[in-house]
C-alpha cells in the first residue's frame, strides 16, 4: 500500500522536511502532489511525467519544493503555513489513479520569554502578584521556576492561563526569590531571565539590645534598636514618652539616676506605612541594688523538670555568686551556671533540691545578698507504708491501720479491701474484727499535682491460732570477724511473745547476741564459724504457740595458716616425696605449691617419685578463700641426704 | 561562565553502542540547556540532541531518533549521550553546547561549547 512518511514529522521554521514515499507502484505514468488531504487542481504543487522527466509546477508551488524520481518531496526553508497535510496522486500506465496522504507539523523557533508582573512591590500578607511568561505562543507549553527548582506545592501559588500566568497570593517575606518561566514546544525551549520578587514587610517588632536594663550610674547606656524591615525601618528613639533622635542606636555617656525610666524604640517603614514599638525600662542604680532570684518553675516535678534560678537584676561587669543551704555550690553534673554566672539551672530536681538558694552581687566592698528562695519540689508519692506492720490479729480485737507515703503536695489516701474501695482517709479503723475481717488491704496514696498514684497491699489474717513462724535473714553467707546478722521472726502479730532457740537450748548470754524489735529481731554481730548453728524461732500468745523450721547459719571463715603434713623435714635420696596441706575454711580453699619460690601446681597434695639432693628447699603451700576474699600460706625446708648419711631418716611415702 | 568538557568518544563496531558525557564547571549546572552537535570531516556543523534545564524535555534530530538518548545529571553536573546501533554515518566529532536561554536544534543559540569527541564507526 502507498504510504507517506514525513521527516521529520514536527519541523522548525526555516528547516526542511522530506515526504518520503513507501510502496510506490511499478509502470507509472506520472504523479502529482497536492496541498490538503484531497486532489484539488487549484491547490496542485507540483506534476512530474516519467516518459519526459519534466516537472510542472502547480499553483500551490512557492519555489520551495524539489520533487525526485522516487516520487519524494522535499520541502525546503519551512515556513508556519506549510503545516498540514499532504496527498500524493499517483497515475499508473494503465491509467488507474491511487492517491496516499502524509503529514507534519511546524513549529517556530521560540523566543525567550520574559515576565511580567501586575505588583512590583508587593505589602506582606496583603497582597497578590501575578507573573505573567511573555509572549503568548501558540502550542507552547510554560513552566515556572522557584530558586532554579520546579514550583512547591502550596495553596498560595495558583498556574492559570494554560500555566502562563502564576499567581503568589498573600505573599510574605519567605516569597522573595528568583522566579523564571519556560516556554517549550516540540522544537525548542526558552528561559526567561530570573525576576526577584521584592516583598515589603514590617517592621517586626523591635528588639533592643543589649538585654540587660540595669545600670550602675556613671556608666555609659549604649542602646541598638532592630526590627525586619524591608526597606530598612527608620528609627526614633523615645525616653519617658519624649522624643529624642531619630538614629538606630541611642548613647547616653555617664548616665545618673536621673536617666532611669521607660525607653521605647519605633521602627517605621515608609512603604509598608508600619509602626512597631518596644519598650524598655532602664533602671539606674547609685549603688548596687539588693538582688532577687526568678525561677522559671515555681512547682517543679522531681525527676521531670529543670529549674533555672536567675539572680536579678542584670548588671554589666558585675561578678554574681550562688549558695546553697548556706553553702558555696556544690560540685554536681545537675547544676549548670550560665557563663556569666547570672543562672543558675538544677537539672531534673529532686526533693533534696528545695534549697534554700541565695544569689550575690559582689562590688568592690562587699557582697549583697538575695533574700533566700526555697523551691517547692512536688514529688511522690512514694510507696506508702502500712502501720503497724501486723499481719495477724486475734479475733475480737480492734483493727486500727494507718497509711503514709512521702508526697508533696501531701497524698491523698484510699482503702480497699480485697479490691473494694473502702474510705478515703489516711487511717482505716474496724472495731471487733472477726476472721471475715482477713483479706488484702491495699492501701492507695495519689498525688493531685503531679497525677502520680502508688499502692501498697497488706495480708491482714484474723486467727485465735498464731501460725507456724519462718526466720528470714539480712545476710545468707557471713564472713567471720567481719559481718553482722540479722534474723527476724516472721509474721508480726499482736500481743505475741518472740522466743529464740540455738542448738536447742535458750540464748547463751553473749554480748554479740541482741534482742530488739519486741524481741522478733536476733542480731549477732562479728560473727564466728561457732555461730553456724541451728537456730528457731517461736512465737506463743494465750491460746497458742508455734516454732519455726530450724535454719542453719553459714558462716564463712578462713583460711587459716596451712599445716604440711608429715611433720618431716629430712628425706633420703630415692624416696617419694608425699606432702599434703590442709586449712580450715568455708568454702574449700584452693590450694597451691611453690618450691623454691617456683609455682607448681594447684592441688592440695604434692608428690615428687624418687626425689634426689636437687629436691632439697623450700616448699610452701599458698591457701586462697574466694569467698572471703582472704589468703594464707605456711613454708616448709626439705633436706634430702644421700642415701645411707642420715640415720633415722623418713623413707618417705 | 560554564566550561564544558566532552569525553566517552572512540572507535566502535557498526551496531555498537557508546556513551559520551560533558562535565560542565565554572556556573551552576542547572542553570543551563544543553545540546549535542557533530561535525562530520567537510561537512556542516549538524544538530544531534537537546534537553532543556530540568531534564523533563528533549528533542533529537531525525536521523539519531530512536538510537540516541540525552539525558543530564544535575547533582553531577553531567550531561551525556547514549548512542546504540551505531552507524558508518555517525562517525564524527562530537560537541556539548550550552545555552542559558535557549534549548532546541539552532547551533547560534548556544553561547558555550566543549572542544569535542571523536567517534569512528568502522568494522
Known amino acids: 500500500k502507498l504510504t507517506i512518511e514525513s521527516t521529520p514529522f514536527n519541523v522548525a521554521e526555516g528547516k526542511e522536511v522530506l515526504l518520503l514515499v513507501h510502496n510506490l507502484p511499478q509502470h507509472l505514468f506520472g504523479y502529482s502532489w497536492y496541498k490538503g488531504e484531497r486532489v484539488d487542481g487549484n491547490r496542485q504543487i507540483i506534476g512530474y511525467v516519467i516518459g519526459t522527466q519534466q516537472a510542472t509546477p502547480g499553483p500551490a508551488y512557492s519555489g520551495r519544493e524539489i520533487i525526485y524520481p522516487n516520487a519524494s518531496l522535499l520541502i525546503q526553508n519551512i515556513i508556519q503555513n506549510d503545516t498540514g497535510f499532504y496527498t500524493l496522486h499517483v497515475i499508473k500506465s494503465d491509467l488507474v489513479n491511487e492517491e496516499a496522504t502524509g503529514q507534519f507539523r511546524v513549529y517556530p523557533e521560540l523566543p525567550k520569554p520574559s515576565i511580567s508582573s501586575n505588583n512590583s512591590k508587593p505589602v506582606e500578607d496583603k497582597d497578590a502578584v501575578a507573573f505573567t511568561c511573555e509572549p503568548e505562543t501558540q502550542d507552547a507549553t510554560y513552566l515556572w521556576w522557584v530558586n532554579n527548582q520546579s514550583l512547591p506545592v502550596s495553596p498560595r501559588l495558583q498556574l492559570s492561563n494554560g500555566n502562563r500566568t502564576l499567581t503568589l497570593f498573600n505573599v510574605t517575606r519567605n516569597d522573595t526569590a528568583s522566579y523564571k518561566c519556560e516556554t517549550q514546544n516540540p522544537v525548542s525551549a526558552r528561559r526567561s531571565d530570573s525576576v526577584i520578587l521584592n516583598v515589603l514587610y514590617g517592621p517586626d517588632a523591635p528588639t533592643i539590645s543589649p538585654l540587660n536594663t540595669s545600670y550602675r550610674s556613671g556608666e555609659n547606656l549604649n542602646l541598638s534598636c532592630h526590627a525586619a524591615s524591608n526597606p530598612p525601618a527608620q528609627y526614633s528613639w523615645f525616653v519617658n514618652g519624649t522624643f529624642q533622635q531619630s538614629t538606630q542606636e541611642l548613647f547616653i555617656p555617664n548616665i545618673t539616676v536621673n536617666n532611669s525610666g521607660s525607653y521605647t524604640c519605633q521602627a517605621h517603614n515608609s512603604d509598608t506605612g508600619l509602626n512597631r514599638t518596644t519598650v524598655t525600662t532602664i533602671t539606674v542604680y547609685a549603688e548596687p541594688p539588693k538582688p532577687f532570684i526568678t525561677s522559671n518553675n515555681s512547682n517543679p516535678v522531681e525527676d521531670e523538670d529543670a529549674v533555672a534560678l536567675t539572680c536579678e537584676p542584670e548588671i554589666q561587669n558585675t561578678t554574681y555568686l550562688w549558695w546553697v543551704n548556706n553553702q558555696s555550690l556544690p560540685v554536681s553534673p545537675r547544676l549548670q551556671l550560665s557563663n556569666d554566672n547570672r543562672t543558675l539551672t538544677l537539672l531534673s530536681v529532686t526533693r533534696n533540691d528545695v534549697g534554700p538558694y541565695e544569689c550575690g552581687i559582689q562590688n568592690e566592698l562587699s557582697v549583697d545578698h538575695s533574700d533566700p528562695v526555697i523551691l517547692n519540689v512536688l514529688y511522690g508519692p512514694d510507696d506508702p507504708t502500712i502501720s503497724p506492720s501486723y499481719t495477724y490479729y486475734r479475733p475480737g480485737v480492734n483493727l486500727s491501720l494507718s497509711c503514709h507515703a512521702a508526697s508533696n503536695p501531701p497524698a491523698q489516701y484510699s482503702w480497699l479491701i480485697d479490691g473494694n474501695i473502702q474510705q478515703h482517709t489516711q487511717e482505716l479503723f474496724i472495731s471487733n474484727i472477726t476472721e471475715k475481717n482477713s483479706g488484702l488491704y491495699t492501701c492507695q496514696a495519689n498525688n493531685s499535682a503531679s497525677g502520680h498514684s502508688r499502692t501498697t497491699v497488706k495480708t491482714i489474717t484474723v486467727s485465735a491460732e498464731l501460725p507456724k513462724p519462718s526466720i528470714s535473714s539480712n545476710n545468707s553467707k557471713p564472713v567471720e570477724d567481719k559481718d553482722a546478722v540479722a534474723f527476724t521472726c516472721e509474721p508480726e502479730a499482736q500481743n505475741t511473745t518472740y522466743l529464740w532457740w540455738v542448738n536447742g537450748q535458750s540464748l547463751p548470754v553473749s554480748p554479740r547476741l541482741q534482742l530488739s524489735n519486741g524481741n522478733r529481731t536476733l542480731t549477732l554481730f562479728n560473727v564466728t564459724r561457732n555461730d553456724a548453728r541451728a537456730y528457731v524461732c517461736g512465737i506463743q500468745n494465750s491460746v497458742s504457740a508455734n516454732r519455726s523450721d530450724p535454719v542453719t547459719l553459714d558462716v564463712l571463715y578462713g583460711p587459716d595458716t596451712p599445716i604440711i603434713s608429715p611433720p618431716d623435714s629430712s628425706y633420703l635420696s630415692g624416696a617419694n616425696l608425699n606432702l599434703s596441706c590442709h586449712s580450715a575454711s568455708n568454702p574449700s580453699p584452693q590450694y597451691s605449691w611453690r618450691i623454691n619460690g617456683i609455682p607448681q601446681q594447684h592441688t592440695q597434695v604434692l608428690f615428687i617419685a624418687k626425689i634426689t639432693p636437687n629436691n632439697n628447699g623450700t616448699y610452701a603451700c599458698f591457701v586462697s578463700n574466694l569467698a572471703t576474699g582472704r589468703n594464707n600460706s605456711i613454708v616448709k625446708s626439705i633436706t634430702v641426704s644421700a642415701s645411707g648419711t642420715s640415720p633415722g631418716l623418713s623413707a618417705g611415702a | 561562565e560554564v566550561q564544558l568538557v566532552e569525553s566517552g568518544g572512540g572507535v566502535v563496531q557498526p551496531g555498537g553502542s557508546l556513551r559520551l558525557s560533558c562535565a560542565a564547571s565554572?556556573?551552576?549546572?542547572?542553570?543551563?540547556?544543553l545540546g549535542w552537535f557533530r561535525q562530520a570531516p567537510g561537512k556542516e556543523r549538524e544538530f544531534v540532541a537537546a534537553?532543556?534545564?530540568?531534564?523533563?524535555?528533549?528533542y533529537y534530530a531525525d536521523s539519531v531518533k530512536g538510537r540516541f538518548t540525552i539525558s543530564r545529571d544535575n547533582a553531577h553536573n553531567t550531561l551525556y549521550l547514549q548512542m546504540n546501533s551505531l552507524r558508518p554515518e555517525d562517525t564524527a566529532l562530537y560537541y556539548c553546547?550550552?545555552?542559558?536561554?535557549?534549548?532546541?536544534?539552532?547551533?547560534?543559540?548556544?553561547?558555550?561549547w566543549g572542544q569535542g569527541t571523536l567517534v569512528t564507526v568502522s568494522s
Open positions: 553546547a550550552a545555552s542559558s536561554d535557549y534549548a532546541g536544534g539552532n547551533p547560534t543559540g548556544y553561547p558555550y
Open positions: 565554572g556556573h551552576t549546572f542547572s542553570e543551563y540547556a
Open positions: 534537553i532543556n534545564w530540568g531534564g523533563g524535555w528533549t
